[in-house]
């Protein structure tokens, strides 16, 4: 059975509008229905209608369709405002250009290429023919309008009123020639509704066949009308989701306007010495970020790969390595020539109006009041007022509503890692924004004025299973499997969540991974009774530069004698130097006949300064790192141990204080190991666990 196509994409929608007929002779047909889609299907097929349907109105209050043989351009009709009405006009009847060969063209051009008036289709004078409206139903052979009922090569044509010229093509342009855009088409508001390969675009207000976040009501300024090509997210050119279930989206073939002029409203005020607004019009030659690090050239991919190239962002003046703001960021910025610092803001450029805008944040950004409204992964922020319920769920005080305006990045919950926002994407409820800390800002992001040294352990009783303290158990240890082989360690911190390292995920296909819990042997030998094998359903990447990942399990682990969770430390806590800790892993042991059993190496905590000395001053540790040296020379984490934990004990409580990440050498004698400091990221971990949905057991 042929699947009925959804034809609403063939209509232009005018919200809160209806048509009133002034000419009483005009017919109308009405019927009760549930959705506008049903109206559209009937209009397109003309099923049960005594006329050719050109438009319809959907009455949302009465759940009723009104089908019309006319549209807003017809005589004897006027448009009227009406809250409960939505007008849908078949695009074929209002389009003044053709797609492909123009088979679907139903416009009102009635003059040929050389200027001869067309002969009416129902007439046999001056030329007899077989193209009768009754023989070509649905081809709209009305009046003397140009048509292409057989889809012939030259496009729409007609028999002419000149007896000497039997027929001639009409000069109707291709829609792709009529439509043009400036720059990368962010301001394009034209009527192109199909992709460069000819696929019909999906309506922005529909979620089938592709679910998406670009809802017209959420982004009223993006021009998400009907199913027209748009560029809401800074792509190289306009695009749309397609009606092909196998092709999520595609670019549209819209040429660049000949004179490349922009509307006055689109042109940012150009400045060379200072920043106006967010500095999108800054065209000066400053080429270092705030702390003096030189900028990378925009046309270079070294040391940082990116897509902010002059080719992709025309009109943004991405010359040389000058600070620019091509993407609507907080202020001009650039990629840096330091391989360890991807981007930086050029916040040393003065504001033309000193009271306007903010380029960066101080401390943890809780007082940041700039107007960036995009996450680091490019998702558009959703309005704060739509998310207050969620916000109240994870903070225990009343947020300052005066700061939470629009959908700007803010930090209402005192997050240590800077401003963030909600996204409206159910899989990624919130994320951080790409904003740097201000020049010379030394405010610590962890502020603990009441307690200069916070204990890492939470004051609670040690849990006991079957009368044996769980401290003898390593049930929180996870073997992350990649294509059936152990690749990394991890720590079970909650039934559905594993803390591990970013580098442990070489493939983007989550089907390539499994988590093994409750095992002692890396191959699971002898662990059959206690082993739990769980699939991975999502990866949540940690704050920028953290190298952490929270891995969500497809179903919660069952806690028993062999599988348990490990505690997290208090946020911002300090563990005393010389505290004895352990690293666990199934990684490289240096032994030829490795038995595959879980190994432990005993380390002790070392202060950051002392640690730096042991690394001959080549490494400077920051507040997000923790250092631990080996009691036994040459023991410590290595390949296969990455993602695993540094476990320490305080007040008889075991906690994961560090995560093993690549890049710090492999159990090098006299070189202490440097780990990601979990205490620094503890609030982020709690926030993810609290805000991300997990499957119920």
């Amino acid at each position: 059975q042929r699947k009925r196509r959804n034809t609403i994409h063939e209509f232009k929608k005018s919200a809160k509008t209806t048509l009133i007929k002034i000419d009483p002779a005009l017919k109308i047909k009405t019927k009760k229905v549930n959705t506008a889609d049903q109206c559209a299907n009937r209009c397109t097929r003309n099923k049960g209608l005594p006329f050719t349907c050109k438009a319809f109105v959907f009455d949302k209050a009465r759940k009723q369709c009104l089908w019309f043989p006319f549209n807003s351009m017809s005589s004897g009709v006027k448009k009227e405002f009406g809250h409960e009405f939505d007008l849908y006009e078949n695009k074929d009847y209002i389009r003044n250009c053709i797609i492909g060969k123009g088979r679907s063209y139903k416009g009102t051009v009635s003059i040929t290429k050389s200027g001869i008036k067309c002969q009416p289709w129902s007439s046999m004078i001056p030329h007899e023919h077989s193209f009768l409206p009754s023989s070509y139903r649905g081809k709209d052979l009305q009046e003397n309008y140009c048509r292409n009922p057989r889809g012939e090569e030259g496009g729409p044509w007609c028999f002419t009123s000149n007896p000497e010229v039997r027929y001639e093509v009409c000069d109707i342009p291709q829609c792709s020639e009529v439509e043009c855009m400036t720059c990368n088409g962010e301001s394009y508001r034209g009527l192109m509704d199909h992709t460069e390969s000819g696929k019909i675009c999906q309506r922005w207000d529909h979620q089938t066949p592709h679910r998406h976040k670009f809802l017209p009501e959420r982004y009223p300024d993006k021009g998400f009308d009907d199913n027209y090509c748009r560029n809401p997210d800074g792509q190289p050119r306009p695009w749309c989701y397609t009606l092909d279930p196998h092709t999520r989206w595609e670019y549209c073939a819209i040429k660049t306007c000949a004179d490349n002029t922009m509307n006055d409203t689109d042109v940012p005020l150009e400045t060379t010495e200072c920043i106006q607004g967010q500095g999108e019009g800054y065209r000066g030659t400053v080429n270092t970020i705030w702390n003096g690090i030189p900028c990378q050239r925009w046309d270079s991919q070294y040391p940082h790969e990116h897509d902010m190239t002059p080719e992709n962002f025309k009109c943004k003046d991405l010359r040389e390595n000058y600070c620019r703001n091509p993407d609507g960021s907080e202020s001009p910025w650039c990629f840096t020539t330091d391989p360890n610092i991807r981007v930086g803001y050029c916040s040393q450029i003065p504001n033309c109006d000193m009271s306007h805008g903010q380029d960066c944040y101080r401390g943890n950004g809780k007082n940041y009041m700039g107007n960036l409204s995009q996450t680091r992964s490019g998702l558009t922020c959703s309005m704060w007022d739509k998310n207050m319920e969620d916000l109240h769920r994870h903070i225990f005080w009343e947020p300052d509503a005066s700061k939470l305006n629009e959908n700007y990045c803010r930090n209402p919950d005192d997050d240590a890692h800077g401003p963030w926002c909600y996204t409206g994407n159910p899989l990624i409820p919130w994320d951080y924004c790409p904003i740097s800390r201000c020049e010379g800002d030394t405010t610590p992001t962890i502020v603990n004025l009441d307690h200069p040294v916070i204990s890492c352990a939470k004051t609670k009783q040690l849990r006991v299973v079957n009368g044996i303290p769980t401290r003898t158990n390593i049930g929180w240890m996870v073997s992350l499997r990649y294509r059936n082989k152990h690749i990394c360690g991890g720590s079970l911190i909650k039934e559905s969540w594993v803390l591990t390292a970013r580098q442990c995920f070489p493939s983007r296909d989550l089907k390539d991974y499994e988590a093994w819990l409750g095992i002692h042997d890396v191959h699971g030998r002898g662990d059959e009774k206690c082993k739990q094998v769980l699939n991975v359903s999502q990866l949540v990447y940690g704050p920028e530069g953290s190298d952490l990942v929270l891995m969500k399990l497809a179903r919660p682990a069952v806690l028993d004698d062999f599988v348990s969770t490990i505690d997290l430390p208090n946020y911002g806590c300090t563990i005393p130097e010389k505290t004895s800790c352990s690293v666990y892993g199934w990684g490289y042991t240096g032994l030829i006949n490795y038995d595959g059993l879980l190994r432990v190496a005993h380390l002790y905590i070392m202060g950051n300064e002392k640690c730096s000395q042991h690394h001959r001053g080549k490494v400077t540790l920051n507040e997000s790192e923790i250092c631990a040296g080996a009691e036994k020379i040459g023991s410590g984490p290595c390949e296969g141990d990455y993602g695993g934990p540094l476990v320490c004990e305080q007040h008889k409580m075991r906690m994961v204080l560090g995560v093993i990440v690549p890049g710090r050498g492999c159990a090098i004698p006299n070189r202490p190991g440097i780990f990601v400091r979990v205490a620094y990221y503890a609030k982020w971990i709690h926030k993810i666990i609290l805000t991300y949905k997990v499957p119920q057991s």
């Epitope: 670019y251 690749i487 580098q503 493939s507 983007r508 390539d512 390949e639 690549p662």
Partner: antibody
């Protein structure tokens, strides 16, 4: 200068072994995934093997069980140990740097080394 | 398994022509696709990654599009320097993969 230089190619008999080397300069081999890609005379590119930042490896079905990819961080060098060589392994072998720590696109290539398997 | 099918295998064109090469993947890879250009006796050169992002120093006449399973490389106006072989490569996963590259498209002078 950031570059990759392959060596170790040559003529080898069917069933024989060969070890290719790829010396990196300007970056460390342990900070990126690195791959071997080969091209038989007059044929297209064929991916052979990859070693990721965490040390895990992947192989194309044609290389599985016969080839081993490894690296020596102290020498900043990548290797491909090829055993049980067949005539169809004759190709130019390129070593290529993968962007970031996992599977991705290749943003730096060596000049290639020719391996000929023939009796 | 991600099978890569590139078409056509050979394409004859003239300078100034608009050239389109397609790459089909047996299952969805989102936008994780790259395009390379290779000239005889040389190593391949990265042209486009993430389906549509131009690599550094690549002329703007090259463009990439598509997502999911269908991808296209377009050269808007073929130049003498563009006669070469072009390959697509999936950058999604190498799980049970025979080859991460497409079979190649040779663009030759008409």
């Amino acid at each position: 200068e950031v570059q990759l230089v392959e060596s170790g190619g040559g003529l080898v008999q069917p069933g024989g072994s060969l070890r290719l080397s790829c010396a990196a300069s300007g970056f460390t081999v342990s900070s990126n995934a690195i791959s071997w890609v080969r091209q038989a005379p007059g044929k297209g590119l064929e991916w052979v093997a990859v070693i990721y930042v965490v040390g895990a490896t992947d192989y194309a079905s044609s290389a599985k069980g016969r080839f081993t990819i490894s690296r020596d961080n102290s020498k900043n060098t990548l290797y491909l140990q090829m055993n049980s060589l067949r005539a169809e392994d004759t190709a130019v072998y390129y070593c290529a740097r993968v962007y970031d720590s996992g599977w991705n696109h290749f943003n730096l290539w060596g000049q290639g080394t020719l391996v000929t398997v023939s009796s | 398994d991600y099978q890569m099918t590139q078409s056509p295998s050979t394409l004859s064109a003239s300078v100034g022509d608009r050239v389109t090469i397609t790459c089909q993947v047996s299952q969805s890879i989102s936008s994780w696709l790259s395009w390379y250009q290779q000239k005889p006796g040389k190593a391949p050169k990265l042209l486009i990654y993430r389906a549509s992002t131009l690599a550094s120093g690549v002329p703007s006449r090259f463009s990439g599009s598509g997502s999911g399973t269908e991808f296209t490389l377009t050269i808007s106006s073929l130049q003498p320097d563009d006669f070469a072989t072009y390959y697509c490569q999936q950058a999604y996963s190498v799980s049970n993969v025979d080859n991460a590259f497409g079979g190649g498209t040779k663009v030759e002078i008409k």
